[in-house]
């Protein structure tokens, strides 16, 4: 428990005086926070946080979902915590299967344990498949398993959290990793035709093709020196993962002389922007 010099506000004291506590499912959780300026207990786990204004936190019949961090806070904003594991052989993992990874960043597989004394806490591929050779991870029983530096190749990877319990391997529910690619180049844009010569009343239709690694690429048709929003129609294709194509078609059903000008197809992503133009000339 913390100790500070007299006169300074000190953090609350928690009983039992340990950083981690293991209780069996069905047993009682009883936590006492001692502080003259007690404000609240906060319980925090995967899904939510709960508060309790009583200085004694009592859960009569503990369940696996009572596993988590219990924090006592005083009026000075100082706090102290205890992590409670509710050991339930039938529910070794608490899971949130939403799993997104940004390319080149770390991502957390949220499968904290309810029993810290199991062994070999790790990730395994689904259906007995091995994980990619370059996949590195760091297990943390209280948070889950952190995948380091997510690669594009891990997209739609199926995996389980795994532990050994009494000599047997136990798997969590399935996680599917969805990787959001990092933009490492500007979009590729092209136009169906560089210039058009039309008679008044004829239809003007031009298509811009935008290619990028994800549908997050932004694109628009603009008329040079005009703020008017142009009406465009889209067709999209996913040619496999990270090979996205959008066709943005601009149509003027009955072109007029004053529609003449330069039209720009503009696309951008977080890396940068690209554009391509087409010229329309409408004659009487």
């Amino acid at each position: 428990q913390p100790s500070v010099s007299p006169g300074e506000p000190s953090p609350p004291s928690i009983h039992p005086g340990k950083s981690d506590l293991i209780v069996r499912v069905g047993d009682e959780i009883r936590l006492l926070c001692t502080d003259p300026g007690f404000v609240k207990w906060t319980f925090e786990i995967l899904d939510e946080t709960n508060e309790n204004k009583q200085n004694e936190w009592i859960t009569e019949k503990a369940e696996a979902t009572n596993t988590g961090k219990y924090t006592c806070t005083n009026k000075h904003g100082l706090s102290n915590s205890i992590y409670v594991f509710v050991r339930d052989p039938a529910k070794l993992f608490l899971v949130d299967r939403s799993l997104y990874g940004k390319e080149d960043n770390d991502t957390l597989v949220r499968c904290p344990l309810t029993d810290p004394e199991v062994t070999n806490y790790s990730l395994k591929g689904c259906q007995g498949k091995p994980l990619p050779k370059d996949l590195r991870f760091i297990p943390d029983p209280k948070a889950g398993i952190m995948i380091k530096s997510v690669k594009r190749a891990y997209h739609r990877l199926c995996l389980h959290c795994s532990v050994d319990q009494e000599g047997k391997s136990v798997l969590s529910e399935k996680f599917i990793l969805k990787v959001r690619p990092a933009f490492k180049a500007v979009p590729v844009v092209s136009v169906s035709k560089a210039s058009y010569l039309l008679r008044e009343g004829e239809e003007f239709t031009v298509t811009c093709t935008i290619k990028d690694v994800s549908s997050s690429v932004y694109s628009t048709w603009k008329r040079e020196n005009s703020q008017t929003k142009l009406q465009e129609k889209y067709n999209v294709w996913h040619h496999g993962d990270f090979n996205y194509e959008r066709q943005a078609t601009l149509t003027i059903s009955s072109a007029r002389v004053n529609d003449s000008g330069v039209f720009m197809c503009y696309a951008n992503n977080t890396f940068g922007s690209a554009n391509v133009t087409t010229t329309l000339e409408v004659v009487d």
């Epitope: 925090e44 899904d47 939510e48 939403s98 997104y100 689904c126 199926c158 549908s215």
Partner: antibody, heavy 117, light 111 residues
Framework: QVQLQQPGAELVKPGASVKMSCKAS????????MHWVKQTPGQGLEWIGV????????SYNQKFKGKATLTADKSSSTAYMQINSLTSEDSAVYYC??????????WGQGTLVTVSA | NIVLTQSPASLAVSLGLRATISCRAS??????????MHWYQQKPGQPPKLLIY???NLESGVPARFSGSGSRTDFTLTIDPVEADDAATYYC?????????FGGGTKLEIK
């Protein structure tokens, strides 16, 4: 318990912009993705986009790129959506929704945006 | 974009009988046996409420009268038996692929 609080209504003029809020409580705000959904009688429910937990990255439905901007303020556990260059087509109910264990488990009550001169 | 087509657009079912709503996706929403398809109920003036997630899992607190089934492109929401309180609009939603999409909705009326 988990709550997502949204203002009930916003009345805005055409051409203007509106920034609506979604204040989260009852969970660790930075651990969950927040999605935004538009509802109109004609178009039904449409996914606008998502702001990802932790790093504040966003992903948008192409239809709303350039129209909507998603942000978050971690200190106040509040997500925001700004819609610009408003027209009558933007009149709708806008919901924020927390993604939990692959699904939209919690929804705000919605903000009714009315675009009118 | 994955298009979700719900049918019927509306249906009227007598109290105590079974209601069945279908949702067809333009392409598969499955990965490794997980169907990223969910069902929501919405009543006027309220936000959608999650009923079924990952095609067949009942959300906590939702009555067991609601069930979901299906995989890949064809999914079904079943309410059996229907109660008066079930009058609402029901939506399917996929989050297998951006942009996430919703079905057009099915309005259930209780006779």
């Amino acid at each position: 318990q988990v709550q997502l609080q949204q203002p009930g209504a916003e009345l805005v003029k055409p051409g203007a912009s509106v920034k609506m809020s979604c204040k989260a409580s009852g969970y660790t705000f930075t651990s969950y993705n927040m999605h935004w959904v538009k509802q109109t009688p004609g178009q039904g429910l449409e996914w606008i986009g998502v702001i990802y937990s932790g790093n504040g990255d966003t992903s948008y439905n192409q239809k709303f790129k350039g129209k909507a901007t998603l942000t978050a303020d971690k200190s106040s556990s509040t997500a925001y959506m700004q819609i610009n260059s408003l027209t009558s087509e933007d009149s709708a109910v806008y919901y924020c929704a927390r993604e939990r264990d692959t699904r939209f488990g919690n929804w705000g009550q919605g903000t009714l945006v009315t675009v009118s001169a | 974009n994955i298009v979700l087509t719900q049918s019927p657009a509306s249906l009227a079912v007598s109290l105590g009988l079974r209601a069945t709503i279908s949702c067809r996706a333009s392409e598969s929403v499955d990965i490794y046996g997980n169907s990223f398809m969910h069902w929501y109920q919405q009543k006027p003036g309220q936000p959608p409420k999650l009923l079924i997630y990952l095609a067949s899992n009942l959300e906590s607190g939702v009555p067991a009268r609601f069930s979901g089934s299906g995989s890949r492109t064809d999914f079904t929401l079943t309410i059996d038996p229907v109660e008066a309180d079930d009058a609402a609009t029901y939506y399917c939603q996929q989050n297998n692929e951006d942009p996430y999409t919703f079905g057009g909705g099915t309005k259930l009326e209780i006779k």
